[in-house]
């Protein structure tokens, strides 16, 4: 049935970048400016997405593909196809309703987006703390004594707890 219909339907011959123009005896007309059709046989062209405000154009619209947006510096994409832009924070911070706030002691964020997460609890894996965490970085867990072999790092005892934000150098 599909094959029969396509043989009878002149619109099926219209390639991507065109539309089947009912006003012109169903001939294939190019998509007007600022519109596109990504598949053949379309009866209309879709309006191109416009990247305005906090959005910026990552890929221009063409007759066969929609524009793609990303976010201006200081913001990052959220959602499918970058449907939203969210403010960046610094490493060691998280975005709250009141803006970017430092991670609380015992938590960290090593990215410019997302939330502060608790440091890894090394003892859950039977390991010791090799390097203490900061607000920017997670704790590093060392091998358990049974895992140590010649040439491996020895486990150093945890240093005294640091004030958040004081990164060990």
């Amino acid at each position: 049935f599909e094959r029969t219909r396509s043989l009878q339907d002149p619109c099926s011959n219209c390639p991507a970048g065109t539309f089947c123009d009912n006003n012109r005896n169903q001939i294939c007309s190019p998509c007007p400016p600022n519109s596109f059709s990504s598949a053949g046989g379309q009866r209309t062209c879709d309006i191109c997405r416009q990247c305005k405000g906090v959005f910026r154009t990552r890929k221009e619209c063409s007759s066969t593909s929609n524009a793609e947006c990303d976010c201006t510096p200081g913001f990052h994409c959220l959602g499918a196809g970058c449907s939203m832009c969210e403010q960046d924070c610094k490493q060691g911070q998280e975005l709250t309703k009141k803006g970017c706030k430092d991670c609380c002691f015992g938590t960290f964020n090593d990215q410019k987006r997302g939330i502060c997460r608790p440091w890894t609890n090394c003892s859950l894996d039977g390991k010791s703390v090799l390097v203490n965490g900061t607000k920017e970085r997670d704790v590093v867990c060392g091998p358990s004594p049974a895992d140590l072999s010649p040439g491996a790092s020895s486990v150093t005892p945890p240093a005294p707890a640091r004030e958040p934000g004081h990164s060990p150098q």
Epitope: Q91, D110, T120, L124, R137, D138, V140, S167
Partner: antibody, heavy 127, light 110 residues
Framework: EVQLLESGGGLVQPGGSLRLSCAAS????????MSWVRQAPGKGLEWVSV????????YYADSVKGRFTISRDNSKNTLYLQMNSLRAEDTAVYYC????????????????????WGQGTLVTVSS | QSVLTQPPSASGTPGRRVTISCSGS????????VTWYQQLPGTAPKLLIY???HRPSGVPDRFSGSKSGTSASLAISGLRSEDEADYYC???????????FGGGTKLTVL
């Protein structure tokens, strides 16, 4: 013993597509971040993309953003890299790499480095 | 142009000590852990140092890592001919939301 075996490389024309696979064994694949790293002939290492196992988050190098897609199938212990709109400058050996620090216990793998590497698969983009 | 800067080459004689530097910024080395990799000719890279200064099991204690501010260093003491390889530093860069490698240093044992 950690084993990573890449496949899917080959010769492709500019603008073409290729899908790389990396079969993993010898560790709990679903517990580790996985990356693709490439090395152009006679050049240095360039990180391409990473995928996290817990939230499925993905990150990409600017040079491949919008063209490459990383994915994983934890049931098949396999990592993938879908490469579209390939360019001559994408010509490289592509390595699959396992990060240290098992999740979800470990919150961030960045400290532990990439502690397991495959032998690589060559992708050549040329007309 | 790599985000992390390494000298393209370094050399030393057997038994001596050689140091390879890696320079970055506050968005990468300054606030994140540095890792080092060794790539022998014709082989895949191998993790040498993690978390700035720690060695995985099986890596000889001739290899050591350190970090100060926005720079990191890899030191190899008691140099051997089998140490002839390319060495790369790497870290997470939060402003780029991705990992970054140095350009690599080719070590020649004279």
């Amino acid at each position: 013993e950690v084993q990573l075996l890449e496949s899917g490389g080959g010769l492709v024309q500019p603008g073409g597509s290729l899908r790389l696979s990396c079969a993993a064994s010898g560790f709990t694949f679903s517990g580790y971040d996985m990356s693709w790293v490439r090395q152009a002939p006679g050049k240095g290492l360039e990180w391409v993309s990473v995928i996290y196992p817990d939230d499925g988050n993905t990150y990409y190098a600017d040079s491949v953003k919008g063209r490459f897609t990383i994915s994983r199938d934890n049931s098949k212990n396999t990592l993938y890299l879908q490469m579209n709109s390939l360019r001559a400058e994408d010509t490289a050996v592509y390595y699959c790499a396992k990060h240290g620090g098992q999740k979800p216990t470990t919150k961030s793998s960045s400290a532990y480095g990439m502690d397991g590497w495959g032998q690589g698969t060559l992708v050549t983009v040329s007309s | 142009q790599s985000v992390l800067t390494q000298p393209p080459s370094a050399s030393g004689t057997p038994g001596r000590r050689v140091t390879i530097s890696c320079s970055g910024s506050s968005s990468n080395i300054g606030n994140n852990y540095v890792t080092w990799y060794q790539q022998l000719p014709g082989t895949a890279p191998k993790l040498l140092i993690y978390a700035d200064s720690h060695r995985p099991s099986g890596v000889p204690d001739r290899f050591s890592g350190s970090k100060s501010g926005t720079s990191a260093s890899l030191a190899i003491s008691g140099l051997r001919s089998e140490d002839e390889a390319d060495y790369y530093c790497a870290t997470w860069d939060y402003s780029l939301s991705g990992y970054v490698f140095g350009g690599g240093t080719k070590l020649t044992v004279l």
